[in-house]
Amino acid sequence: DTEIKVNPPQDFEIVDPGYLGYLYLQWQPPLSLDHFKECTVEYELKYRNIGSETWKTIITKNLHYKDGFDLNKGIEAKIHTLLPWQCTNGSEVQSSWAETTYWISPQGIPETKVQDMDCVYYNWQYLLCSWKPGIGVLLDTNYNLFYWYEGLDHALQCVDYIKADGQNIGCRFPYLEASDYKDFYICVNGSSENKPIRSSYFTFQLQNIVKPLPPVYLTFTRESSCEIKLKWSIPLGPIPARCFDYEIEIREDDTTLVTATVENETYTLKTTNETRQLCFVVRSKVNIYCSDDGIWSEWSDKQCWEGEDLSKKTLLR
């Protein structure tokens, strides 16, 4: 019995299409596959950012695979051919590994790259990113922001830069169509006549950095002699009611502070007839049903009641 062997894939490479971290891994079939014409060859692909402890593993029949990477670090990948047991009258046969790496040659020292990058997707409508210039860079240094997400033909540059002392320190993004629930890639590079500037790469998903507007139209309704219902409305904008969590702060007679987190636009408060003043504020955040993370809104305007009308049916500001 001759031992069945198979070659690794050919021309294994990592291709950068200019999408700021979304890379193509591609290869060609191995040599000498003539013996296995009736067989569907599979490939086991392993890849990771250099420095990561774990490999991502994919088994595919295709000759390419795409995924996002952190271009601040290098990338390593390896692939081998798999012959399923059906093709070999027995156990699965694997080729040796073909390996490849990819990295962007870093320009400039790390301190020249932008510092404290911060991006917020206000009310799921307006993306604003801001940063601080690199440490020790001169005023002639300017930074440029590029972004890409699946659906764009190519990476786009920021339309509206925020400036300080003539330097770009932020970006207001234009309308971003169909951009949530997918990776959003950003590169901030720079130029200076004095020294090279290190580029920085960032990846996030927009729904996870949403800061909603605060709730509006806060009202009180007396439900019973010892219960008051606090109500409010979702803010104007594209975020549906089902996506909100709320945090309430309630003060009774300037002493008791109640805080609560609720999923609906109402909260029922137990009170006594002795209550002379009631104030509350609410803030909102996108909940776990619509995102993995989020930013609390500012607090709403305070809604207060003072006097003896707390026993009446409805109390508005």
Partner: antibody
């Protein structure tokens, strides 16, 4: 509830200056550009300039030849537009109007401030 | 500066009809894959109201009967079925470059 509340009507003599204020509320003042637009009686709209409250960066319409000055007080969420060397053709309603970046247009407008220039 | 020419200057139509307003720019207002063209409605004694931004995106709270189209130098605002409250003056505006400029306006009046 976004609101832009402008200062009251003004009557000025030719050669004088006028300063119009615009108090913003209901949103984060520094996140949006603030534009100034004027409209002479029965006429169209004329963009005068804009300020980025985030950093104070300003763009002017050069048609006003250094007569216009736009400023902001971030702590008071207020923008100001001052027009100097007034002439009769500056008689108009002056609007402040916010917009998020150049690709979004101008989505909220103040109620307008009437400025009359007459001797 | 970019000059915007609106046509017609006046448009007389009846409620229920379709209105088509045109705006032509003296040079392209496209950049970064975006058309920097906006449309506003203004009624007497009121501030303008944003209808359409980036040529085709509806402003907040704008009814679906308002739509925008076009790119480069030629843009159109369409009101699919006129309501009585739609009779007003409509302005186009470019925000591609400073100074931002407005068209002269189209007055939409009841026939």
């Amino acid at each position: 509830q976004v609101q832009l509340v402008q200062s009251g009507a003004e009557v000025k003599k030719p050669g004088a200056s006028v300063k119009v204020s615009c108090k913003a509320s209901g949103y984060t003042f520094s996140n949006y550009l603030m534009n100034w637009v004027r409209q002479a009686p029965g006429q169209g709209l004329e963009w005068m300039g804009r300020i980025d409250p985030y950093d104070g960066d300003i763009d002017y319409n050069q048609n006003f030849k250094d007569r216009v000055t736009i400023t902001r007080d971030k702590s008071a969420s207020t923008a100001y537009m001052e027009l100097s060397s007034l002439r009769s053709e500056d008689t108009a309603v002056y609007y402040c109007a916010r917009g998020y970046g150049t690709a979004y247009g101008v989505d909220y407008w103040g109620q307008g401030t009437s400025v009359t220039v007459s001797s | 500066e970019i000059v915007l020419t609106q046509s017609p200057a006046t448009l007389s139509l009846s409620p229920g009809e379709r209105a088509t307003l045109s705006c032509r720019a003296s040079e392209s207002v496209d950049n970064y894959g975006i058309s920097f063209m906006n449309w506003y409605q203004q009624k007497p004694g009121q501030a303008p109201r944003l209808l359409i931004y980036a040529a085709s995106r509806q402003g907040s709270g704008i009814p679906d009967r308002f739509s925008g189209s076009g790119s480069g130098t030629d843009f159109t605002l369409t009101i699919s079925r006129l309501e009585p409250e739609d009779f007003a003056v409509y302005f186009c505006q470019q925000s591609k470059e400073v100074p931002w400029t407005f068209g002269g306006g189209t007055k939409l009046e009841i026939k």
